[in-house]
């Protein structure tokens, strides 16, 4: 059920997944919506507590029943993710936040005319996730007009504090406003040797690229296919970065593919949504439910309609047994990061992903690839 | 593979599940062995760091590959759980620890003759998990001969500090040395209304009782069977306690069963090991692997031989299809607490648990019920 209303002075009890810091309840809901497991959130507004270090905390929550008990809490704002909602979603956030300092790794500083120019700098820098700009009213004269570009491991500030004379905001890459080079090539027989920031399991290089695109710090990736010699690394998608934003070393190896994040591209293909079916493929994960349905499309729809389902494996009925019209078995699954924990072949399953992330692709994208 | 050797001045890197405090590396390995997911541990011995609050930390670890990288660390002791080992295991620890204060909730104090009598008091008290005894050499004369009975939520101390003139140790309930009443009755149509400390999913009241027995603070339980009217509570095993150690209120309700922990019984039946098969029952959880095997016994054996497997669901081959000799499909599974996340019926699976916990039942038990 889609709940767009937010609940003022209310906190959801329990179900905590993690705590991040966001400048508003709206942005907190955005983070919750994009998080693989978050269904509910509680945001601690400014002045919600005597301890300013707790302000702007965005507590991401999950619940097996999709609901949690509500308790009164002054200054808290609670609500539900938009995963359960039909409308088109965007990761784009153009808002700027006056007198808020969003803390992160300050890796670049420069003097610019205004906050808009600072935001443009952030949008056109591969590493930048958010910025803080010291306006002409900033108390320290030496720091006025200074634009700080920032990033964190999670893509959200490590903390947020009140600070007069500054303006903060997020990169507009996801609004399709970046001028950074968009490299769509996937390089066969290529391993990139740079720093691994994370690894996930993926069925193919395209899904690996989408996961890299969706990841806060991934700039490029290497994917080991099913034919990769080292069994424990098959279907492994290595998410990578480098200081320059470009790979430093390319190694030629069969059955590996590499490529770039599409985070700063103007998308004409889905980058969040993995619409394909994978034949004779089992996705392993945490099981949510088992339902009997007719066909893999119905199984995918069932998964998409379940707010907690991230991927599925469908076993068709045994045609050998003259049961052509019988239902197959649909296993609804999830994991901590939204990707299967393992991928197996040769067991007769047909696997795929929930399509609820398709709502996050832009309108052109979904017209081209409506599923 | 069974590794009994411990590695001095070595720490395992990554894979952290949780940190508890234990008085020795031996006890740390015991905790790791009984933890549903722990396969490796790192114990921080006394003087392992400049910060005494880090001494006696027992870091429980897991790894998909069952191994982790080793790094040099002065004062650390690392090793593997005994899950992978064939020998009979015991939860019984008779050692006492001189000049160590094991911190917990001090809920009872009395003057006794010696440390042995203090340990007996702990063993004969329903809530007591461990104790600290102030000897005749304790600096404060007023506190000498004082026996403090303690418990924590986890069953292990919250911290451990050096303190001259004290002796600490654990309850000997698991050594079969408690004189506490052993109540084996399971009460049909009964709900106990006391404090819930945890809840898990179980296929029947006997498994629920074994889980309660294995839980550090559970004294009695209520189990809702498959016929319980509220669907979301079916197969729910509520683990309970009370200040007196006895249930305060019993409510008569159909399709519920209640009973007591067997933690202080001298066992003649398995209390850790769940050997039964559950027909037409699917155990849902996090999937580890899918293997094709002949028969549920082989599936159970495959699960038992996999150190990370906790339970399984086996789907027999379709006899309808004249494939009598074909292998069925064996799904190996795990969860955060060792119990299924859901139990479903009517889908044709045969489910059960790994038998690796059978090694923890005493010799009489396993002779009576060898599976």
């Amino acid at each position: 059920e889609c709940v767009t209303k937010v609940f003022k002075d209310i906190s959801f009890q329990g179900g905590d997944l993690s705590t991040v810091f966001t400048p508003s309840a709206t942005y907190c809901r955005l983070v919750c919506t994009h998080h693989p497991r978050c269904l509910l959130f509680t945001f601690m507004a400014e002045s919600s507590s005597d301890d300013p270090t707790k302000w702007f905390a965005c507590i991401l929550k999950d619940s097996v029943t999709e609901i949690l008990p509500m308790v009164n809490m002054t200054g808290a704002i609670s609500g539900y993710s938009f995963k359960q909602c039909p409308q088109q979603l965007s990761t784009c956030s153009k808002d700027v936040y006056v007198n808020l300092d969003m803390k992160g790794m300050n890796y670049n500083s420069s003097v610019v005319k205004n906050a808009r120019e600072c935001q443009e700098r952030c949008t056109d820098d591969a590493h930048c996730q958010f910025f803080t700009y010291a306006t002409g009213y900033f108390p320290s004269v030496d720091h006025r007009k200074m634009c700080l570009l920032k990033y964190t491991r999670t893509g959200t500030p490590t903390t947020i504090t009140k600070l007069n004379g500054v303006v903060s905001g997020f990169s507009l890459k996801s609004c399709g406003l970046s001028n950074l080079a968009c490299i769509r090539d996937i390089f066969p027989n290529t391993v990139l040797a740079d720093l691994n920031i994370d690894s996930v399991v993926a069925p193919d290089a395209f899904v690996c690229r989408r996961i890299c695109t969706h990841h806060p710090t991934c700039l490029f990736f290497t994917f080991f296919s099913q034919a990769w010699p080292k069994e424990s690394q098959r279907h492994l998608c290595l998410l990578k970065t480098s200081e320059s934003g470009l790979p430093s070393t390319r190694i030629t190896k069969s059955h590996a593919l590499s490529g770039f994040s599409l985070q700063h591209c103007r998308h004409s293909v889905p980058v969040f949504c993995h619409p394909s079916f994978y034949n004779d493929t089992d996705f392993l994960g945490e099981e949510l439910d088992i339902v009997d349905v007719k066909g893999q499309e119905t199984c995918q729809k069932t998964c998409t309609n379940n707010a907690r389902c991230q991927f599925f494996t469908y076993y068709p009925s045994h045609r050998l047994c003259n049961e052509r019209n019988r239902r197959g078995r649909c296993y609804l699954k999830l994991s901590s990061n939204g990707s299967p924990t393992r991928i197996l072949h040769g067991r007769g399953g047909i696997s795929g992903y929930s399509l609820r992330l398709c709502k996050m692709d832009n309108v052109c994208t979904t017209k081209i690839n409506p599923r | 593979e069974c590794v009994t050797k411990v590695f001095k001045d070595i720490s395992f890197q990554g894979g952290d599940l949780s940190t508890v405090f234990t008085p020795s590396a031996t006890y740390c390995r015991l905790v790791c062995t009984h933890h549903p997911r722990c396969l490796l541990f790192t114990f921080m011995a006394e003087s392992s760091s400049d910060d005494p609050t880090k001494w006696f930390a027992c870091i429980l670890k897991d790894s998909v590959t069952e191994i982790l990288p080793m790094v040099n660390m002065t004062g650390a002791i690392s090793g593997y759980s005994f899950k992978q080992c064939p020998q009979q295991l015991s939860t019984c620890s008779k050692d006492v620890y001189v000049n160590l204060d094991m911190k917990g909730m001090n809920y009872n104090s009395s003057v006794v003759k010696n440390a042995r009598e203090c340990q007996e008091r702990c063993t004969d008290d329903a809530h007591c998990q461990f104790f600290t005894y102030a000897t005749g050499y304790f600096p404060s004369v007023d506190h000498r001969k004082m026996c403090l009975l303690k418990y924590t939520r986890t069953g292990t101390p919250t911290t451990i500090t050096k303190l001259n003139g004290v002796v600490s140790g654990f309850s000997l309930k698991s050594c079969g040395l408690s004189n506490l009443a052993c109540i084996r009755d399971i009460f049909p149509n009964t709900v106990l209304a006391d404090l819930n400390i945890d809840s898990v999913v179980a296929p029947d009241a006997f498994v629920c009782r074994r889980i309660c027995t294995h839980h550090p603070t559970c004294l009695f339980f209520t189990f809702f069977s498959q016929a319980w009217p509220k669907e979301s509570q079916r197969h729910l095993c509520l683990l309970k306690t009370s200040e007196s150690g006895l249930p305060s209120t019993r409510i008569t309700k159909s399709h519920a069963l209640s009973g007591f922990s067997l933690q202080h019984c001298r066992h003649s039946v398995p209390v850790f090991c769940h050997p039964s098969f559950y027909n037409d029952t699917d155990f849902l959880g996090e999937e580890l692997d899918i293997v094709d095997v002949k028969g549920q016994e082989t599936c159970q054996k495959t699960c038992t031989n996999n150190a990370r497997c906790q339970f399984f669901t086996y789907y027999p081959s379709h006899r309808l299809c004249n494939e009598r000799n074909r292998r069925g499909r064996c799904y190996l599974k795990l969860s955060s607490n060792g119990s299924p996340t859901r139990i479903l019926h009517g889908r044709g699976g045969i489910s059960g648990y790994s038998l690796r916990l059978c090694k923890m039942d005493n010799v009489c038990t396993t002779k009576i019920n060898p599976r």
């Epitope: - | 506490l180 009443a181 109540i183 009755d185 004294l219 007196s244 006895l246 249930p247 305060s248 019993r250």
Partner: nanobody
Framework: QVQLQESGGGSVQAGGSLRLSCAAS????????MGWFRQAPGKEREGVAA????????FYADSVKGRFTISQDNAKNTVYLEMDTLKPEDTAMYYC?????????????????WGQGTQVTVSS
């Protein structure tokens, strides 16, 4: 306040039977331990039998197993001790005790509430 009242003691020949009763008032015996203890002159008080009143679990000292039976009537808040095949060494003052906690059921030091006792004499 809690009161326990024993009755049914007396003198009997060896091989005979007696039935002791313990009526509890001031608390409900629905989830407690009730025990029978005895003390012979010059000896320590020893546990004879106990019952968990929330069910039917019973506990006996080895010396009385098969001869003594403890039972309860929750409606009357009363616990009974049926003593058969009595022996001279069963001669003692018999006490009823109650503990509203999970305890070691045959250990006297674990019980909080005690009755005044009833004398049982078995002659040969």
């Amino acid at each position: 306040q809690v009161q326990l009242q024993e009755s049914g003691g007396g003198s009997v020949q060896a091989g005979g039977s007696l039935r002791l009763s313990c009526a509890a008032s001031g608390f409900t015996a629905s989830s407690n331990f009730m025990g029978w203890f005895r003390q012979a002159p010059g000896k320590e008080r020893e546990g004879v039998a106990a019952i968990y009143t929330g069910g039917a679990s019973t506990f006996y000292a080895d010396s009385v197993k098969g001869r003594f039976t403890i039972s309860q009537d929750n409606a009357k808040n009363t616990v009974y001790l049926e003593m058969d095949t009595l022996k001279p060494e069963d001669t003692a003052m018999y006490y009823c005790a109650a503990a509203p906690r999970w305890i070691a059921p045959l250990r006297a030091d674990r019980y909080e509430y005690w009755g005044q006792g009833t004398q049982v004499t078995v002659s040969s």
